[in-house]
């Protein structure tokens, strides 16, 4: 989307709303870069493929990240 902007961040608003890990299709963590100076977390929901930007500072989102990484470590051999 051609937003006329000086940086190339993805998130316009961020959500603090808790996300059920089971409703997640995908979770992307984009680290700070020369294009965007802060961490961006983008959740893709199973329902309608909605993508939601999450607040990295939110306690609920930190808990979600822990849950997801725990789930991943269980799956990996």
């Amino acid at each position: 989307i051609p937003l006329s902007r000086t940086v190339r961040c993805t998130c316009i608003s961020i959500s603090n709303q808790p996300v059920n890990p089971r409703s997640l299709e995908k979770l992307e963590i984009i680290p700070p870069s020369q294009f965007c100076p802060h961490v961006e977390i983008i959740a893709t929901m199973k329902k309608k493929g909605e993508k939601r930007c999450l607040n990295p500072e939110s306690k609920a989102i930190k808990n979600l990240l822990k849950a997801v990484s725990k789930e991943r470590s269980k799956r990996s051999p």
Epitope: I1, L3, C9, I12, I14, K51, R52, C53
Partner: antibody, heavy 124, light 109 residues
Framework: QVQLVESGGGVVQPGRSLRLSCTAS????????MHWVRQAPGKGLEWVAV????????GYADSVKGRFTISRDNSKNTLYLQMNSLRAEDTAVYYC?????????????????WGQGTTVTVSS | EIVLTQSPGTLSLSPGERATLSCRAS???????LAWYQQKPGQAPRLLIY???SRATGIPDRFSGSGSGTDFTLTISRLEPEDFAVYYC??????????FGPGTKVDIK
């Protein structure tokens, strides 16, 4: 409750400047992208500008590009629109509106909270 | 630049009837970027639908959105007296980034 209150409108001569403010309350202002949308008398809605939650993303309608500047002060819960080189066609009610939680360049949650608007009249 | 066209310009109906409002884009628009708003005289707009078909918080289920590509529809299954207003579709994406349609006025027959 969640509220947006615009101020700063008035009557101004063509070529002059005006700064609009929008004060937010009842929600964490620094988490939300914000917009200015205007409506000329008896006409439809026209989007003016957007600013991301941290002030890094900005976008403008072609009709105001180079003349208007959107900014925000998260410590004051306030959104601004600096309007320079005003023209008669900028006469309108100016609304500030909140971008839905979690909106990104991939998915748009709409403008879910609106102020009641402030009137700008550009006339000699 | 994507242009949105809404039809009809005015829809005259009675309470209890079904209203079907159309929004057509000059180029394909992702349904992720399509929203609908309601505006009553002297009031600010109110978000009804986002993502082409998801109802915003607090919006009654008589309002529904559908469509994809270039053709989108807002349906009000049974008009209530408070539904008589102007309805705008809006897209997000191509320059000038956010575009509103010209609106459809739903008035009492």
């Amino acid at each position: 409750q969640v509220q947006l209150v615009e101020s700063g409108g008035g009557v101004v001569q063509p070529g002059r400047s005006l700064r609009l403010s929008c004060t937010a309350s009842g929600f964490t202002f620094s988490d939300y992208g914000m917009h200015w949308v205007r409506q000329a008398p008896g006409k439809g809605l026209e989007w003016v500008a957007v600013i991301g939650y941290g002030g890094l993303i900005k976008g403008y309608a072609d009709s105001v590009k180079g003349r208007f500047t959107i900014s925000r002060d998260n410590s004051k819960n306030t959104l601004y629109l600096q309007m320079n080189s005003l023209r008669a066609e900028d006469t309108a009610v100016y609304y500030c509106a909140r971008e839905g939680a979690g909106s990104s360049v991939y998915y748009y949650y709409g403008m879910d909270v609106w102020g009641q608007g402030t009137t700008v009249t550009v006339s000699s | 630049e994507i242009v949105l066209t809404q039809s009809p310009g005015t829809l005259s109906l009675s309470p209890g009837e079904r209203a079907t409002l159309s929004c057509r884009a000059s180029q394909s628009v992702s349904s992720s970027y399509l929203a609908w708003y309601q505006q009553k005289p002297g009031q600010a707009p109110r978000l009804l639908i986002y993502g082409a078909s998801s109802r915003a918080t607090g919006i009654p289920d008589r309002f529904s959105g559908s469509g994809s590509g270039t053709d989108f529809t807002l349906t009000i299954s049974r008009l209530e007296p408070e539904d008589f207003a102007v309805y705008y579709c809006q897209q997000y994406g191509s320059s000038p980034i956010f575009t509103f349609g010209p609106g459809t006025k739903v008035d009492i027959k």
